[in-house]
């Protein structure tokens, strides 16, 4: 009752390795590293046939076919590579996943490089079988901002794609009769968040408590640069708004807020985000300069079908901006102290201008970011938030524009984003 | 440290238009709304409406719809209360209040005495 | 519109003792954010309005500890624990609740 002599499959072998077998001998059938079983067209580890009494094999041998990882994974905002040739998935095949530059760079400057396993799963060296992330680039326009050496005195159009942060704010609150809307500025920190300020998205009905205006309420447009073109601009309704709870509206004391859109926003040359300052109470250093965009909407009789169709001339059709330079904290603390009334500036914000006044302090709406150029990151950094100062008192001597100081509020920032601090690689400043 | 300045008494005839004004100082003006708050002689407080001072939208109580406007300068800090077609029972003292619901702080007072 | 009536219309007192007013509003004043938007102020004779107590029982700065404001939905008091000469007045409850916002027809508190 002895079997026919066993052939092992090619890229296999077959255990143990008798020069004869008899009836109840067993074999099992294994593959090489990187192939499986195939038997039925069903893949397994390992396959076993028995020595019958009439001197035949319970079942033929199976085949070995090599281990195929099948398609990646399609990454978010991401592209794959195939390093080898017919694009083969199978076992030692290389893929590199890559983000999409400039607007996405993957976390923790990973290779992105992935190899077929044996047990027939994309393998990276770092992250194992997860998928790399594509992190938005940030405070890296697609056009160079100006050298920030020569002072600019007054407004300057900005080119399309200079301030790809620059969101425009619609609040229009249709429960109120008549409909109230007003416009601010903010600034975006991801796909899905604009930074803007408190007092921007705060419903004026109260005065006695803050009550933030209902997400209903907001549209935010981003790449928008010129009010008369809507065409290209990204239009996103709100998901949640979010005042910092200790927001004072006696001395806008903590005057951020934040806007989660519906949507994460697709980025592009006109739509980027801005970088976080690092969690600094001492804010940008005085003398700094940094810049400030808006569309100077200061007008209160201009409605929003105007705003965003026909242009209105109260408002400049064209993106502004405006090189301020850091005021020291002391000297602008006295220069609202010697005015009649009870104007504080806090250790929260900090202020920027020229004692000699000018249109400049103006230019940028509420909630607009203050941003300045990191040299260390060679990126740009929200260090402040448009807030008062202006424009009731705008242009005046000696008057400086205040801001909130966003250093003082990383942290609560990326709690309310659902981001670890540690996630996100923070651009640092100075 | 906060004031409001209304402008001073105005004497007109039935049919005219008057503007009183109410400058604000000593704190940041957009942060509050603005109440306009109406006391005929020997009367109590009738409340008029109220602007958005960040946003210029004027809101009005249904017996001041009409006639009766609201409006700002916002560089200048200054709320506005146009009568238009004065009528003898506008004779009153007009206030303007911080806030459009809190009236926290309030004007001296404008008198506007409406007489043929 | 919500009406606000306030009792007593006249209320003589001597220098040193209590008063008691009362404001009633025809319907609750509790907003839906929680808050109760019930205030209360004094307009002295040939001066502007000052307000007192906002938010039923909080106290404007400046404002002597003598008054205090309590209630809830519909009824509301202020109270004055020992009256000043500089007490004497109109004093007016107002809501801020209901659109529009409406006074009570005011309490003249005059000195015996």
């Known amino acids: 009752n002895e079997c026919p002599e066993l052939q092992p499959p090619v890229h296999g072998k077959i255990e143990p390795s008798q020069a004869k077998y008899f009836f109840k001998d067993q074999v099992l059938v294994s593959c090489d590293t990187g192939y499986k079983v195939l038997k039925d067209n069903v893949e397994m580890d390992t396959f076993q046939i028995e020595c019958l009494k009439d001197g035949t094999w319970s079942n033929k041998i199976p085949t070995c076919k090599i281990v195929d990882c099948r398609a990646p994974g399609e990454l978010e905002h991401g592209l794959i590579t195939f390093s080898t040739r017919n694009n083969l998935t199978t076992y030692k095949s290389e893929i590199k996943y890559s983000c999409q530059e400039p607007y996405y760079k993957m976390l923790n400057n990973n290779t992105g490089i992935y190899t077929c396993s044996a047990q027939g799963v994309w393998m990276n060296k770092v992250l194992g079988r997860s998928l790399p992330t594509c992190l938005p680039e940030c405070g890296q326009p697609s056009r160079s901002l100006p050298s920030l050496v020569k002072r600019i005195i007054g407004g300057r159009n900005a080119e399309p794609g200079l301030f790809p942060w620059q969101a425009l704010i619609v609040v229009e609150d249709t429960s109120r009769v008549p409909n109230d809307k007003w416009f601010g500025s903010g600034a975006l920190l991801s796909a899905s968040w604009i930074l803007t300020a408190a007092h921007v998205l705060r419903s004026q009905r109260r005065d006695t408590t803050v009550i933030p205006v209902s997400k209903e309420h907001v549209t935010v447009y981003l790449g928008l640069h010129d009010v008369r073109d809507k065409s290209g601009a990204v239009n996103s309704s709100a998901a949640r708004v979010v005042l910092h709870p200790d927001f004072n509206i006696q001395n806008y004391n903590h005057d951020i807020a934040l806007v989660q859109l519906q949507e994460p926003v697709p980025l592009g040359p006109h739509v980027m985000p801005v970088c976080l300052p690092r969690l600094e109470p001492e804010g940008p250093a005085p003398h700094m300069l940094g810049l400030v965009a808006g569309w100077g909407i200061s007008n209160p009789n201009v409605t929003v079908d105007e705003i965003i169709s026909s242009g209105t001339r109260t408002l400049s059709d064209v993106l502004q901006y405006v090189k301020l330079p850091v005021v020291p904290h002391a000297e602008c603390k006295t220069s609202y102290e010697s005015r009649s009334g009870n104007y504080s500036v806090t250790e929260n914000m900090f202020c920027a201008g020229y004692y000699e006044g000018g249109k400049d302090t103006c230019l940028g709406d509420s909630g607009g970011a203050f941003v300045i150029f990191d040299d260390l990151s060679q990126r740009w950094v929200v260090q402040g938030l448009v807030s008062w100062g202006g424009p009731e008192e705008c242009g005046s001597k000696q008057v400086y524009g205040v801001y909130t100081k966003v250093s003082n509020y990383v942290d609560w920032v990326w709690e309310q984003m659902g981001l670890p601090q540690s996630v996100v690689e923070p651009q640092v400043e100075r | 440290q906060i004031q409001l300045v209304q402008s001073g008494p105005e004497l007109k005839k039935p049919g005219e238009t008057v503007k009183i004004s109410c400058k604000a100082s000593?704190?940041?003006?957009?942060?509050?709304?603005m109440s306009w708050v109406r006391q005929a002689p020997g009367k109590g407080l009738k409340w008029m409406g109220w602007?958005?001072?960040?946003?210029?939208?004027?809101t009005y109580a249904d017996d001041f719809k009409g006639r009766f406007a609201f409006s700002l300068e916002t560089s200048a800090r200054t709320p506005y209360l146009q009568i238009n077609n004065l009528k003898n029972e506008d004779t009153a003292t007009y206030f303007c209040?911080?806030?459009?619901?809190?009236?926290?702080?309030w004007g001296q007072g404008t008198s506007v005495t409406v007489s043929s | 519109d919500v009406l606000m009536t306030q009792t007593p219309l006249t209320l003589s007192v001597t220098i040193g003792q209590p008063a008691s007013i009362s404001c009633k509003s025809s319907?609750?004043?509790?907003?839906?954010?929680?808050?109760?938007?019930l205030n209360w102020l004094l307009q002295r004779p040939g001066q502007s309005p000052k307000r007192l107590i906002y938010?039923?029982?909080k106290l404007d700065s400046g404002v002597p500890d003598r008054f205090t404001g309590s209630g809830s939905g519909t009824d509301f008091t202020l109270k004055i624990s020992r009256v000043e000469a500089e007490d004497l007045g109109v004093y007016y409850c107002?809501?801020?609740?209901?659109?529009?916002?409406?006074f009570g027809g005011g309490t003249k508190l005059e000195i015996k």
């Open positions: 209040a911080r806030g459009g619901e809190a009236m926290d702080y």
């Open positions: 000593g704190y940041i003006f957009t942060s509050y709304g």
């Open positions: 602007i958005n001072t960040y946003s210029g939208v004027p």
């Open positions: 319907q609750s004043l509790l907003d839906s954010d929680g808050k109760t938007y």
């Open positions: 938010l039923v029982s």
């Open positions: 107002w809501q801020g609740t209901h659109f529009p916002w409406t």
